[in-house]
Amino acid sequence: IWELKKDVYVVELDWYPDAPGEMVVLTCDTPEEDGITWTLDQSSEVLGSGKTLTIQVKEFGDAGQYTCHKGGEVLSHSLLLLHKKEDGIWSTDILKDQKEPKNKTFLRCEAKNYSGRFTCWWLTTISTDLTFSVKSSRGSSDPQGVTCGAATLSAERVRGDNKEYEYSVECQEDSACPAAEESLPIEVMVDAVHKLKYENYTSSFFIRDIIKPDPPKNLQLKPLKNSRQVEVSWEYPDTWSTPHSYFSLTFCVQVQAKSKREKKDRVFTDKTSATVICRKNASISVRAQDRYYSSSWSEWASVPCSGSGSSRGGSGSGGSGGGGSKLRAVPGGSSPAWTQCQQLSQKLCTLAWSAHPLVGHMDLREEGDEETTNDVPHIQCGDGCDPQGLRDNSQFCLQRIHQGLIFYEKLLGSDIFTGEPSLLPDSPVGQLHASLLGLSQLLQPEGHHWETQQIPSLSPSQPWQRLLLRFKILRSLQAFVAVAARVFAHGAATLSP
């Protein structure tokens, strides 16, 4: 038994036929010693007397609000809730399994940007006697604060004969660092109580993995002379992180009629305009995704082809916002070849995802995972890799990136990747290895040697352990190179001479 909140207790029960249940001792919160009686819920039947009451809790009939009285006066209450465990698994009767992205997904969370603000939602078919409370933190062993509001009913839907209720909650990380590479996941815990049943649900994620931008805004069409083609332009959504030269998006543009079976024109672009073929009765749709990290695509923003072309052409915000004049030279060091670094770091992003695209969809977090991921270098909040830090002195950040590149390059050349099951030299991992080396050499200033970090002794003995470790390393590398690519894209747009 444990206290959920003041005067509310949760009794954990192994739930099987003829289970012995749990013996619970309730104590009346009063200085009185004599003449105390106990009742359950609305019943006036006296269950016992004395300052304490011992009960055997086996089923829901034994749960409820226990009240101690003296001479018709209520002294205190204790509400007992039951948490069922069947075959070693805690019950999940209150919430509906959303089955996306995998089975046993009860909580789903999304973030519109990297500000540390996110929304979680869940579904239930229960309409009454239902309460939720939500707690969140970053990391579990040394948790950092995340503040969540109250869960509210956000939607009702009819599914066949049933009504389905969607609840949602908004949370905000207290000291968010949008430009940093997350090393500890956000933990979300939802306590659900239906009548006398208690259940808890958890979700663990990095903000980068739950990013889903809002749709692009201000779609405009401009027909091209003497052509079937139309120039479509758009802008970054207002809710996306800034500056856009750092937090860049990539876009998918599609022309299609209402029916999904219809033929279509489709093109991908990093710009904020594209030229497509518009057909009568079709619509042009545009959606966005983080350019350097393969999280979710936004919903589509659409405009009908038949709509009159706006007079405004051009390419919107260009994905390289940040504006302002070119910035001064980096103090205390030479500037890197920003554009070359940008191209190579973008290639690294692509390779990191193609080295194993499934890595992105495998849930590799497990016990002790915080230790494993802490063995690799992360671009942290104080490393100066945010736009302002780069403006002040990019050397701190570049040194950190260089250390990381060397570290991962050594890791990809180590027994973890060279041992069984073997990988060929020109596999995506081999290409990744070579590109990490290439970028680190571009960064290393002449006659200047930055200190590098030692590789931890991670090498496992079993091939299956090696495979799991590869997945984890590639997963971390995907996050690391995404931050590096943002740094170089921003540098190329605002710092290069």
Partner: antibody, heavy 118, light 107 residues
Framework: QVQLVQSGAEVKKPGASVKVSCKAS????????LHWVRQAPGQGLEWMGW????????EYAPKFQGRVTMTTDTSTSTAYMELRSLRSDDTAVYYC???????????WGQGTMVTVSS | EIVMTQSPATLSVSPGERATLSCRAS??????LHWYQQKPGQAPRLLIY???QSISGIPARFSGSGSGTEFTLTISSLQSEDFAVYYC?????????FGGGTKVEIK
């Protein structure tokens, strides 16, 4: 399944015209874009243009603009590509292909060899 | 127009070995890049679309990667039926253009 059957080989004199046909089956003709791509002997692939059988819209590669005409006959599910003012360097295998997506080529015809020789 | 350059022109590989084919665009084309295989006397066949998307019915040994200007087609373990000419094609803008092809031959 989706199938494209093209007309037989042709031999033409320089300055003449050729009209190659491409009969589609296994799908609703107006549901796919139709492209024409050619390949000179021992050479690579060269895109010529596309037609939307639903409305007759076309887009031609600048190189063939004014010399090529693509048409369709929805009653027979057939596409046609006419190339005029033939030169010896137009000697090639001409392929039609179909796709629901406009910009790449999923289903290909078997090809029609057009030889331009005096 | 966008010029597509493939390398090498010819690649000699032994059966069972891995083959890596490169394709470079004259300007950034995001992931608007597709790969085809052509055997002698046959029409080309689509292998990969949008740089890395696999086609049902195409063996899993064919994979694509890349974005921007550099792209790679990888055949993880060459089978006898894989010896052919491979073409890349950009769809970023009209006119659609192909690379000159890479001939994969038996070593």
């Amino acid at each position: 399944q989706v199938q494209l059957v093209q007309s037989g080989a042709e031999v033409k004199k320089p300055g003449a015209s050729v009209k190659v046909s491409c009969k589609a089956s296994g799908y609703t003709f107006t549901d796919y874009y139709l492209h024409w791509v050619r390949q000179a002997p021992g050479q690579g692939l060269e895109w010529m243009g596309w037609i939307d059988p639903e409305n007759g819209d076309t887009e031609y590669a600048p190189k063939f603009q004014g010399r090529v005409t693509m048409t369709t006959d929805t009653s027979t599910s057939t596409a046609y590509m006419e190339l005029r003012s033939l030169r010896s360097d137009d000697t090639a295998v001409y392929y039609c292909n179909a796709n629901k997506e406009l910009r790449y080529f999923d289903v290909w015809g078997q090809g029609t060899m057009v030889t331009v020789s005096s | 127009e966008i010029v597509m350059t493939q390398s090498p022109a010819t690649l000699s590989v032994s059966p069972g070995e891995r083959a890596t084919l490169s394709c470079r665009a004259s300007q950034s084309i995001s992931i608007n890049l597709h790969w085809y295989q052509q055997k002698p006397g046959q029409a080309p066949r689509l292998l990969i679309y949008f740089a890395s998307q696999s086609i049902s019915g195409i063996p899993a040994r064919f994979s694509g990667s890349g974005s921007g200007t550099e792209f790679t087609l990888t055949i993880s373990s060459l089978q006898s039926e894989d010896f052919a000419v491979y073409y890349c094609q950009q769809s970023n803008s009209f006119p659609l253009t192909f690379g000159g092809g890479t001939k994969v031959e038996i070593k």
